[in-house]
Interface confidence: low
Amino acid sequence: QPPPPPPDATCHQVRSFFQRLQPGLKWVPETPVPGSDLQVCLPKGPTCCSRKMEEKYQLTARLNMEQLLQSASMELKFLIIQNAAVFQEAFEIVVRHAKNYTNAMFKNNYPSLTPQAFEFVGEFFTDVSLYILGSDINVDDMVNELFDSLFPVIYTQLMNPGLPDSALDINECLRGARRDLKVFGNFPKLIMTQVSKSLQVTRIFLQALNLGIEVINTTDHLKFSKDCGRMLTRMWYCSYCQGLMMVKPCGGYCNVVMQGCMAGVVEIDKYWREYILSLEELVNGMYRIYDMENVLLGLFSTIHDSIQYVQKNAGKLTTTIGKLCAHSQQRQYR
Amino acid sequence: SAYYPEDLFIDKKVLKVAHVEHEETLSSRRRELIQKLKSFISFYSALPGYICSHSPVAENDTLCWNGQELVERYSQKAARNGMKNQFNLHELKMKGPEPVVSQIIDKLKHINQLLRTMSMPKGRVLDKNLDEEGFESGDCGDDEDECIGGSGDGMIKVKNQLRFLAELAYDLDVDDAPGNSQQATPKDNEISTFHNLGNVH
């Protein structure tokens, strides 16, 4: 074992180093002292440390540790924060484009249905946005509301344009008929399936990214225990008390200390791994009806086809609805 | 035939000079995020080692500090922590995670459960053809230029695949920089059933 170097006779080196940590020299002894009051840097002989210095070292060690932890997670944190923002905005853009496509489809193919159609389409896509952001809305209700609102306008403007302007009573009858007679065939159900599945996955994807940020933030701002502070102080600063300013901690010793300090944090590891692998599984499944980009951008076309389905069946529907909503229609004509 | 406005498409003249190579889809961006996240899969288990490697540790020196004294770097004493009679390292480990860490672990467990549920193939109706449930999927009308994907996956996409990430105010990797790209050259005013199936795996 190498002999310990002679202690600094004047504690000068320790003083100049400590001054950087804590301006003002009143805590540093002029010359080495017995240090019987020390609790962490237990001396083997005379020491250049005081109890107050020890406390300052502990505080600094914990701060250092927190900074190291923050710098360790900086790249990961930025990756998730940036992507969460990118995806959230990208999803908003998808919704905006989908709304524009749907409005353009109405404007160019069914001008007589606008501006009412614009209003219903706008409400639908507002609900879509809110749902993605976590709002407690039922997707099936959203789709039903869209078709319930559209059908009275389609009936009165396209199928039966001779009718006077819609009044509330026939509208209510037509809304009921829409479901009873499966006026749009299976299109609403098709859209419900696609929209609910794709939005569910999108919503969970965003929730997962935001939780990722929360996980990093939590571990980023952990306050380390006093025990950990003492261990870190022994490792990083106690050598200074002996005037060993240039010496560094042993690698294996550092690992032991860090594992002790980070025992709680490391417990996250299992769930973090699972989180990334589960997120990967989800992402691998985000295609076809599980891809909101794919689904929402195709909606205008599906809605167009659903209206054409109604038009193809207009003869039969007009007759049936004529009987079903006759009472409402008679009142309208009066 | 259904008329679709030119404003839904990229201008045909622009198509000639479009930078097809910079097309970026949400799907590819998601996959890239996962690839990058996977490089952090050992983040928490590697933290102690990471912090040691980013704080002063004796690497080339002959002597190092073991918490009590100066020792030779490769001696047995180098790994000892010299904490006799002070506080027990094992005890420190046994204390268990702080409440805030336990809380975040619970949240992770919950989201992992949700993610797994959403990813489970048996929880999906990918293969259940909606035609069985009354969807009349017959041929498209004679005068129509597009068809619906009846089983819920053949969605139509407008010609100009959206380049969302180009519209975002974030500086992404140069490699990811999206630009104008074309899906196909539109013939007349048709809407094509051609769409992004690049993420169907």
């Epitope: - | 996959r31 089983s151 899906q183 051609f194 690049g198």
Partner: antibody, heavy 119, light 107 residues
Framework: QVQLQQSGTDLARPGASVKLSCKAS????????ISWVKQRTGQGLEWIGE????????YYNEKFTGKATLTADKSSSTAYMELRSLTSEDSAVYFC????????????WGQGTALTVSS | DIQMTQSPASLSASVGETVTITCRAS??????LTWYQQKQGKSPQLLVY???TLAEGVPSRFSGSGSGTQFSLKINSLQPEDFGTYYC?????????FGTGTKLDLK
């Protein structure tokens, strides 16, 4: 202009492995998937799988899982297909093909690599 | 997987004639169908996608039609360069599968 240049004719022994290459030029390699297609003499075409060069993610036709391994090198804009445990059934012409946009429509094809497996 | 069946398997015709090749899908693929032409010893070339959209540079004598499960490729006024093998392929999802092929040769 877009080109896919494939490696030349290959002769391999049964049980061996072989790696075919497909060098892309004329477009940004990372923006489109590259598919591999098998054609046995006088027979039809079979899709093996595709690689997304940007992330290097491969996707396989179940039939070829375990037989083919698809990789891509972004720096050289080259896609590779490794075929292992070769048998005479693997003797065929193998084409690489570029995705048209983002779907399984192939607008540009390589000239093909003829592979003969024989002892 | 979706099976694609072409008919006829082979066909002889003369220059100037009109021919029609058909392709049947084992399930509804809507309009997700592509046609390719392949000449002996060469790689396939894209002719038509989405059942009826002509690829860039393809002569207008070629036309595609159909949707659902029945599709056809019609070639008006055959030219010498049109002889070869024609394949249909669905692009409805993974795995894309190709038809059995129709060999068109000179009568």
């Amino acid at each position: 202009q877009v080109q896919l240049q494939q490696s030349g004719t290959d002769l391999a022994r049964p049980g061996a492995s072989v790696k075919l290459s497909c060098k892309a030029s004329g477009y940004t390699f990372t923006s489109f998937g590259i598919s591999w297609v098998k054609q046995r003499t006088g027979q039809g075409l079979e899709w093996i799988g595709e690689i997304y060069p940007r992330s290097g993610s491969p996707y396989y036709n179940e039939k070829f899982t375990g037989k083919a391994t698809l990789t891509a090198d972004k720096s050289s804009s080259t896609a590779y297909m490794e075929l292992r445990s070769l048998t005479s059934e693997d003797s065929a012409v193998y084409f690489c093909a570029k995705d048209f946009g983002s779907s399984y429509v192939f607008d540009y094809w390589g000239q093909g690599t003829a592979l003969t497996v024989s002892s | 997987d979706i099976q694609m069946t072409q008919s006829p398997a082979s066909l002889s015709a003369s220059v100037g004639e009109t021919v029609t090749i058909t392709c049947r899908a084992s399930e509804n693929i809507y309009s997700y169908l592509t046609w390719y032409q392949q000449k002996q010893g060469k790689s396939p070339q894209l002719l038509v996608y989405n059942a009826k959209t002509l690829a860039e540079g393809v002569p207008s004598r070629f036309s595609g039609s159909g949707s659902g499960t029945q599709f056809s490729l019609k070639i008006n006024s055959l030219q010498p360069e049109d002889f070869g093998t024609y394949y249909c392929q669905h692009h409805y999802g993974t795995p894309p599968t190709f038809g059995t092929g129709t060999k068109l040769d000179l009568k």
